[in-house]
Interface confidence: medium
């Protein structure tokens, strides 16, 4: 039997030291932050990388990871000879298992794998494997890069010295040296059969906290065919607490992976906290922005002939994997909230990463259903205006779906934002459906073990006087063409309303596959083909917040953890340095710019040229080496939200007329100083409906689940 713990995300950690075997038993201990001092963090948003530094001071250090490795400036280190691997050629035992930590997918190694050489101070034992990936279609997902080139996936193997410590966790907690290997996965036409056990495992840990045993695999087969060409540098954990204790070995050559196999990574879910609401989202882009090298020197191995046979295109294509086939990451922080009895406000934030700037405008699409009839409307909103729209003449008995897409030059589009559902007059919470692999809910209720984790909990924010249901589902952050053959009428109305009796609220992050096929012409410019809806029966669900939980270990506190939110920006940037960086003059070499706003500042925009840097010890000048990806604040208002309603006094309640959209002028604070999301409840005068409910998760609530049992052999995901 699998024992699940579904944690409010602020109660779980995701850094490399977080997941380890309890030496006195077989349980995995997820340490609680109150006891350990580990703050909640995320890869984007208000808890994103630029904010890690405020609660994990080491994240602001100067020897941080990941980095971009410029081959021409890496010096050959004669001490970096052949790696000695021991045990890597053995098949893994059936006790090796995989876990979705919510921040990554980790493989807990139960066999003895040792590495020595490569300048490591001793013989190090492999503890675990973690993965980092992008969002779709082989987009950049690696943390490290070589000559500016990033890869779709990076696998990291973490090691500790068992002669010095009895466990990996002890080494971390005592701030002692650990080792890490970084292995890049690159897209190839064919499946890599060596990855099959991993891919199969991924399908068993789709949801946060899921665990599964892995079929036997050979760890050596997950490494590049040639191990002779590698880079070495001293850095840090790439997740909080960002301890600067890692001896990194970064392999030059990638491991092949097919698009089909990549999809298993893109299908992983996590839970995120947004303004007290727990939402289920795809776990994507789980990489830390790159950090500056500062006074460090990157070395390369001195293994004879190992550097002579690298693929020419690898060296000649500095950009490598395109950041995306779309012009930016999706608009984020989608919110739908009622302004009064007949109007809704949709708000969002600008994308965190813009691959092909600038954003010209945003397409806001919304559909609604009434009496099985389906309607849709799309309109544009200039990107330099406040990123919110008012939908007036809202019908209380219609179900509304909203999503936003950024539009760049040449009609290039971003990925779609998460899709928000809203309906007033709710009578019960939508929590009984199953989400199948395509993201289309089936009408049949799921068993309790397979309940989609979409209920946000049972506490009600009564102080607002505005009760509505906010229920969370998976994000539809697919490619910009991710329309589907399913229609809102057929899927949403019949499935959700008829099949489930869903009556209201906003469902955050509805799957994009539920969006209607008939998107307006303006909103369907992407040339990519829509993927067919495959109604598989594999549930991507995990128990809801009230799932089984084990007792807290040793009475460790499980309260909300440390979040030292001192930085102005709430949009964690992806591919730029935020907290470990200094200065803000330079662009990333790939031409990526970043829209997320940081603190008030009037620095010039980044320019391609960058100051020369002299490497310590080498005395050679390295032109433009240190990419500084520090967020440069903009005058855009994209980061701002929670403006006053700005209501139209002439709005008329109507259940017959389709809603109209109006742009809303923001009358708030300095546009250069984006505010954090306001937690302030709306006034009673703005309330939408007395019989709606706003389901939230109270951050102060305790989660008494301190341990998670390892999966029993009899029950595989």
């Amino acid at each position: 039997v699998l024992h699940y713990v579904v944690c409010f995300p602020a109660l779980t950690e995701g850094y490399v030291g977080a997941l380890h075997e309890n030496r006195h038993g077989s349980a995995v201990q997820i340490r609680r932050r109150k006891a350990s001092g580990d703050p909640y963090w995320a890869y984007s948003g208000a808890y994103g990388p630029e904010h890690w530094v405020t609660s994990s001071v080491s994240c602001g250090g100067r020897h941080q990871s990941p980095i971009d490795i410029l081959d021409q400036y890496a010096r050959v280190g004669e001490e970096y000879q052949e790696l000695q691997l021991d045990g890597f050629d053995n098949e893994s035992s059936n006790k090796t298992w995989m876990k979705n930590t919510g921040k990554t997918v980790a493989i807990l190694l139960k066999d003895d794998y040792f590495v020595s050489g490569a300048g490591l101070p001793g013989r190090f034992k492999a503890e675990k494997v973690e993965f980092h990936w992008g969002h779709s279609n082989g987009s950049a997902g690696s943390e490290h890069s070589i000559n500016g080139r990033r890869f779709p996936v990076e696998m990291q193997i973490f090691f500790y010295n068992p002669d010095d410590f009895d466990s990996f966790q002890t080494a971390i907690s005592e701030n002692r040296i650990i080792g890490a290997m970084a292995i890049f996965f690159q897209v190839s036409p064919r499946d890599n059969s060596a990855l099959d056990p991993i891919i199969h495992g991924l399908k068993g840990v789709v949801h946060h906290e899921k665990e599964t045993f892995l079929d036997p695999f050979v760890l050596r087969d997950l490494l590049p065919a040639s191990l002779g060409s590698y880079y070495r540098y001293t850095g840090s954990l790439t997740t909080p607490p960002c301890s600067e204790i890692v001896e990194w070995i970064v392999f030059r050559r990638p491991v092949p992976i097919s698009y089909h196999q990549l999809e298993a990574f893109y299908s992983i879910f996590t839970t995120e906290q947004q303004d007290h609401v727990k939402s289920v989202e795809y776990l994507r882009n789980n990489f830390r922005p790159q950090q500056r090298l500062h006074d460090r020197v990157v070395s390369k191995s001195a293994v004879r002939d190992s550097w002579n046979h690298d693929m020419t295109d690898f060296l000649e294509n500095p950009l490598g994997t395109e950041a995306s086939k779309v012009c930016s990451s999706p608009p984020i922080h989608m919110k739908v909230q009622p302004l009064n009895q007949t109007a809704l406000q949709v708000s969002w934030s600008q994308p965190e990463t813009i691959y092909h700037p600038p954003i010209m405008n945003y397409m806001i699409s919304y559909s609604w259903t009434k009496n099985e009839d389906e309607k849709e409307k799309t309109f544009t909103k200039d990107s330099d205006k406040d990123l919110k729209a008012t939908i007036s003449h809202v019908s209380p008995d219609s179900l509304y779906l909203f999503r936003v897409q950024a539009v760049c030059r040449n009609d290039m589009r971003s990925d779609f934002s998460q899709t928000m559902l809203f309906q007033a007059n709710t009578t019960r919470i939508f929590q009984g459906t199953r989400i199948v692999k395509t993201g289309v809910p089936t009408a049949s209720p799921a068993s309790s073990a397979d309940m989609a984790p979409i209920s946000s909990g049972s506490s009600t924010w009564t102080s607002s006087g505005i009760p509505f249901s906010f229920v969370s589902m998976a994000t539809g952050m697919g490619p910009s063409s991710s329309g589907s053959q399913a229609t809102v009428a057929s899927v949403v109305t019949s499935t959700l309303l008829a099949g489930l009796g869903f009556g209201g609220g906003g469902i955050s992050s509805f799957p994009s596959t539920v969006w209607p096929t008939r998107l307006p012409t303006a909103a369907s410019a992407s040339k990519q083909a829509a993927r067919p809806v495959l109604a598989t029966t594999e549930a991507l669900a995990s128990p809801g917040p009230d799932g089984d939980s084990s007792p807290t270990k040793d009475g460790e506190g499980t309260e909300e953890g440390e979040k030292d939110e001192k930085s102005e920006s709430e949009d964690g940037e992806r591919e730029h340095e935020e907290d470990g960086e200094k200065d803000s003059e330079k662009k990333e070499k790939s031409g990526v710019t970043h829209a997320a706003e940081e603190r008030n500042q009037t620095e010039p925009s980044p320019t391609p040229s960058s100051p020369n840097r002299t490497a310590e010890g080498g005395h050679q000048t390295i032109p433009g080496h240190e990419q500084d990806h520090t967020a440069v604040p903009t005058d855009q208002t994209g980061g701002r939200r929670d403006a006053g309603p700005g209501l139209d006094p002439d709005m008329v309640t109507s259940t017959q007329v389709p809603p109209t959209a109006t742009e809303e002028q923001y009358a708030g604070s300095d546009p250069k100083r984006p505010e954090m999301p306001s937690k302030k409840p709306m006034s009673r005068g703005d309330r939408f409906s007395e019989d709606s409910r706003f389901i939230t998760v109270n951050p102060a609530e305790k989660n008494t689940s301190g341990m998670i049992s390892r999966p029993a052999p009899g029950r595989m995901e």
Epitope: S55, V57, G561, E562
Partner: antibody
Framework: QSLEESGGRLVTPGTPLTLTCTVS????????MSWVRQAPGKGLEWIGT?????YTYYASWAKGRFTVSKTSTTVDLKITSPTTEDTATYFC??????????WGPGTLVTISS | SFVLTQPASVQVNLGQTVSLTCTAD??????ASWYQQKPGQAPVLLIY???SRPSGVPDRFSGSSSGNTATLTISGAQAGDEADYYC?????????????FGGGTQLTVTG
Amino acid sequence: QSLEESGGRLVTPGTPLTLTCTVSGFSLSSNAMSWVRQAPGKGLEWIGTIDGYGYTYYASWAKGRFTVSKTSTTVDLKITSPTTEDTATYFCAREIYLGSNFWGPGTLVTISS
Amino acid sequence: SFVLTQPASVQVNLGQTVSLTCTADTLSRRYASWYQQKPGQAPVLLIYRDTSRPSGVPDRFSGSSSGNTATLTISGAQAGDEADYYCATADGSGSSYQFVFGGGTQLTVTG
């Protein structure tokens, strides 16, 4: 967005005193707040910080002498047993780790017998 | 404990350039911020993250960092720049977080 300290007054040594920083325009659940003091003619001295979740950090010299707490819109600094050395102007500040340009005007505390 | 050292006072002629320094062991691993404080007022942030300048701060103020020394440079000093200047940084990690101010430098603008 604004901060304002209050509660500063003249008290005798040993009499507990609580200062309050009232914030508006941003959420304390998303921001860390710090208390800094400045004795007359002296430099700035960090006392402690409370983060978005209510976790507290103190200067080594301040532990046990000061307590930082908060409500939804206020951050309090309790001087548990003031001495004359605690006479100072007390400031609250937001986002001090990387540098804060959100400071209150300060409130003067005088400890005298 | 972590100590930031600043010169107690510095003089500069009107219109000249002056550099205020702040040193500490391992400052190279920390970010420095700089504050200006005039009598009876709260500190005003001039520089954060070693080199970044908030909006509203004149570009006459610039920050730099080299090794274990952070420097605030004021070019074209004006009478209104006469004030106390404090450098600051954070030290430690996690629960042992400590924030430290330097002792301050009193800048006098002459002429």
